[in-house]
């Protein structure tokens, strides 16, 4: 595909990436799919600086990111290494809480009202953020 050199309309450029901030809610999988069809992925937070940028744009609203443990270990959707990477969990999170009564635990990560992360039931209809990198070849699907 051709190289993307500027962000699409209604996307926000920051540090050679483009970000799109939803104003409606979807389950994590539908948000993930939405971003894939944008030739993008749910946001992957790799630094404190990127955390502050995203937090500034989403405000105090629960918002999905591209981090989940639906298949066991925590994984970023673009393949970024979780263990060695940036983390910003709330205290005592993630806890894979089963007490919500919705069946199963909590397998998808989101920004909470203060920006720190929590794991939650993936079916909850939260807002989401898509991210795509500038200078990458377009129309290459992100890694699962």
């Amino acid at each position: 595909g051709s190289e993307r050199t500027c962000c699409p309309v209604n996307w926000v450029e920051h540090e050679r990436s483009c970000y799109w901030f939803s104003r409606s809610g979807k389950a994590w999988a539908d948000a993930d799919n939405y971003c894939r069809l944008e030739d993008a992925h749910l946001v992957v937070v790799t630094s404190w600086e990127e955390q502050k940028f995203v937090q500034h744009h989403i405000g105090p609203v629960n918002t999905w990111m591209g981090l989940h443990d639906q298949n066991g270990p925590w994984k970023w959707v673009d393949g970024t290494d979780y263990e060695t990477g940036f983390k910003n969990w709330r205290p005592e999170q993630p806890d894979d809480w089963y007490g919500h009564g919705l069946g199963g635990g909590e397998d998808c990560a989101h920004f909470t009202d203060d920006g720190r992360w929590n794991d939650d039931v993936c079916q909850r209809p939260y807002r989401w953020v898509c991210e795509t990198e500038l200078d990458k070849a377009s129309q290459e699907p992100p890694l699962l």
Epitope: C7, P8, V9, N10, W11, W20, S24, K26, A29, D30, D32, N33, Y34, R36, L37, E38, D39, A40, C130, Q139, P141, P142, L144
Partner: antibody, heavy 115, light 107 residues
């Protein structure tokens, strides 16, 4: 209830143009990716073009790239496909489809390219 | 592009039979897969989305399973109205791609 209704098909000569429309209702149009899919007589389903939920991604099949243009009007809940430089091999039934979450299809509109 | 390989391309079955159609993706598509039924001269109709979720109004004799690269559509007890063509479709990423189809015919 999700409804998709295509229109604009017809008989056109090679090299001619047509604009297909797809009127959508029953869902938040701007929140979903949409696609055009076609089916030539006696053949399988072939994706033609799509537009992402934000409108920022509008990819095309190689067979129509440079000739077809997808667009949408959110105020009218309508998806469009502008087809230029039509060829005989573009003859097909063209379907509009909502492709994320529960998948929905329109009834289709027939495009015949013939002299 | 993601290739979708569907098998068999056709099958003959009797009313009441259990029918299974398989679809394989050339790369991991998570569960972003739909199964579509099409009868001659009619528009496609979605049966299953998200690999295993039944579309509203579709009878429960249809079921889907799988994740990643391997998927299955099962019709638990074939009825006369089920004789049609069936396609798998990935919507993990553009370009959307379809399997070649399976034509289910009366034995």
């Amino acid at each position: 209830e999700v409804q998709l209704l295509e229109s604009g098909g017809g008989l056109v000569q090679p090299g001619g143009s047509l604009r297909l429309s797809c009127a959508a209702s029953g869902f938040t149009f701007s929140s979903y990716a949409m696609s055009w899919v076609r089916q030539a007589p006696g053949k399988g389903l072939e994706w033609v073009s799509g537009i992402s939920g934000s409108g920022g991604n509008t990819p095309y099949a190689d067979s129509v790239k440079g000739r077809f243009t997808i667009s949408r009007d959110i105020s009218k809940n309508t998806l469009y496909l502008q087809m230029n430089s039509l060829r005989a091999e573009d003859t097909a039934v063209y379907y509009c489809a909502k492709v994320v979450g529960a998948v929905h299809w329109g009834r289709g509109t027939l495009v015949t390219v013939s002299s | 592009d993601i290739q979708m390989t569907q098998s068999p391309s056709s099958l003959s079955a009797s009313v009441g039979d259990r029918v299974t159609i398989t679809c394989r993706a050339s790369q991991d598509i998570s569960n972003y897969l739909a199964w579509v039924q099409q009868k001659p001269g009619k528009a496609p109709k979605s049966l299953i989305y998200a690999a295993s979720s039944l579309q509203s109004g579709v009878p429960s004799k249809f079921s889907g399973s799988g994740s990643g690269t391997d998927f299955t559509l099962t019709i638990s007890s074939l009825q006369p109205e089920d004789f049609a063509s069936y396609y798998c479709q990935q919507y993990n990423s553009f370009p959307l791609t379809f399997g070649g189809g399976t034509k289910v015919e009366i034995k």
